[in-house]
């Protein structure tokens, strides 16, 4: 069953088909409402004054998932918990189409990096998606940022069109993904 999210609240202004977020920086552990406020402007469909979509307000729909580009800074673990609060997980990239969609979205913010749902305990153990599935480098390569000073970048973020490993404690933005079934 597919949940349909309807919203006609005035919490965000609908202008030229875009949600205009208030873009508040939130460096503390956010509440659910502040999480949903802290997102990039996203395209929405207007239907007779009420928005009808399988995604909540402020989320972008692509194929069978809803995506939230969170603009609150947090560690990888904190970002993971933010997504959980919203009933979702950090982004898992399943296909080249999905990767292309994500790259297109984040490339519009060249100053920002976004955590995705890939991590590992340490360099000797393979990368693992948050849901426990294996990572295949056939889809994309992870460019390392390891140095002598920071030898253990064990979480992954995307910056423009490149995917990097990074220290999990570094504050960054994030991408939440909520899969839906038709």
């Amino acid at each position: 069953t597919m949940a349909i999210w309807r919203s006609n609240s005035g919490s965000n202004t609908l202008e030229n088909g875009y949600f205009l977020s208030r873009n508040k920086e939130n460096h503390s552990q956010p509440t659910q409402s502040s999480l949903e406020d802290s997102v990039t402007p996203t395209k929405a469909v207007k239907t007779t004054g009420v928005l009808s979509s399988p995604c909540p307000p402020n989320w972008i729909i692509y194929e069978k998932s809803c995506y939230l580009f969170s603009m609150s800074l947090n560690s990888w673990d904190g970002s993971k918990r933010q997504c959980w609060q919203l009933g979702s997980n950090l982004l898992k990239i399943d296909s080249s189409n999905e990767l292309g969609f994500i790259v297109k979205q984040v490339s519009s913010q060249p100053d920002n990096s976004f955590w995705i749902g890939l991590s590992r305990p340490q360099t000797e153990v393979p990368w693992l998606w948050e849901d426990g599935s294996t990572f295949s480098s056939n889809l994309f390569q992870i460019r390392t940022t390891a140095t002598q000073e920071n030898p253990s970048p064990n979480c992954v973020w995307i910056h423009v069109s490149v995917i990097y490993d990074q220290l999990c404690s570094v504050p960054s933005y994030s991408i939440c993904e909520k899969k839906f079934s038709m």
Partner: antibody, heavy 118, light 107 residues
Framework: QVQLVQSGAEVKKPGASVKVSCKAS????????MHWVRQAPGQGLEWMGW????????NYAQKFQGRVTMTRDTSISTAYMELSRLRSDDTAVYYC???????????WGQGTLVTVSS | DIQMTQSPSSVSASVGDRVTITCRAS??????LAWYQQKPGKAPKLLIF???SLQSGVPSRFSGSGSGTDFTLTVSSLQPEDFATYYC?????????FGPGTKVDIE
């Protein structure tokens, strides 16, 4: 729903080999590591290793290196664990377990009792 | 190999009691720790992963905490079906290793 169904109990003589199967259903078999864990009677749990069903790559605990072989048949979504040169202290229940978040074991087979006795 | 120790090795408790089990790793494992419940003749069941994340379908009376070397599993109000053996498991480095178990039985 995710299900792991293992082959039946085996009785083996010391020095022989045993091959245990684990048939997976309810998810995409090639997407998740399959672990093997054993438990001797009245004892705790011991991780033996894993197989990546997608690539066939394996990672074995040092203790079992040279004696254990993990394989898979993706056409029938089945993982196998073969242990050779059996000793009496290999008597245990052998479990397959599907990987979950943070390298935990979220789904388990029902277990296969392997008895090694002369 | 990383050694995992658990305490106590066994505990007697009554229905409604709050029960706390501790697990200690011989070196830091960040939050790469899971907790399992096992009943006699059955396969283990995952309760907690990532040190504090509750597995789907597990009652909220179970909670996990800790990071680094010291971890805790708490059952806030013990139910009859909770009498079992509990194991911790580290997933920080190979080989993955389990604690020796803590048996929770009826007082």
């Amino acid at each position: 729903q995710v299900q792991l169904v293992q082959s039946g109990a085996e009785v083996k003589k010391p020095g022989a080999s045993v091959k245990v199967s684990c048939k997976a259903s309810g998810y995409t078999f090639t997407d998740y590591y399959m672990h093997w864990v054993r438990q001797a009677p009245g004892q705790g749990l011991e991780w033996m290793g894993w197989i990546n069903p997608n690539s066939g790559g394996t990672n074995y605990a040092q203790k079992f290196q040279g004696r254990v072989t993990m394989t898979r048949d993706t056409s029938i979504s089945t993982a196998y664990m073969e242990l050779s040169r059996l000793r009496s202290d290999d008597t245990a229940v052998y479990y397959c377990a599907r990987n979950s978040g943070s390298y935990s074991f979220g789904y388990w087979g029902q277990g296969t009792l392997v008895t090694v006795s002369s | 190999d990383i050694q995992m120790t658990q305490s106590p090795s066994s505990v007697s408790a009554s229905v409604g009691d709050r029960v706390t089990i501790t697990c200690r790793a011989s070196q830091g494992i960040s939050s790469w720790l899971a907790w399992y419940q096992q009943k006699p003749g059955k396969a283990p069941k995952l309760l907690i992963f990532g040190a504090s994340s509750l597995q789907s379908g597990v009652p909220s009376r179970f909670s996990g905490s800790g990071s680094g070397t010291d971890f805790t599993l708490t059952v806030s109000s013990l139910q009859p079906e909770d009498f079992a053996t509990y194991y911790c498991q580290q997933a920080y480095s190979f080989p993955f290793t389990f604690g020796p178990g803590t048996k929770v039985d009826i007082e």
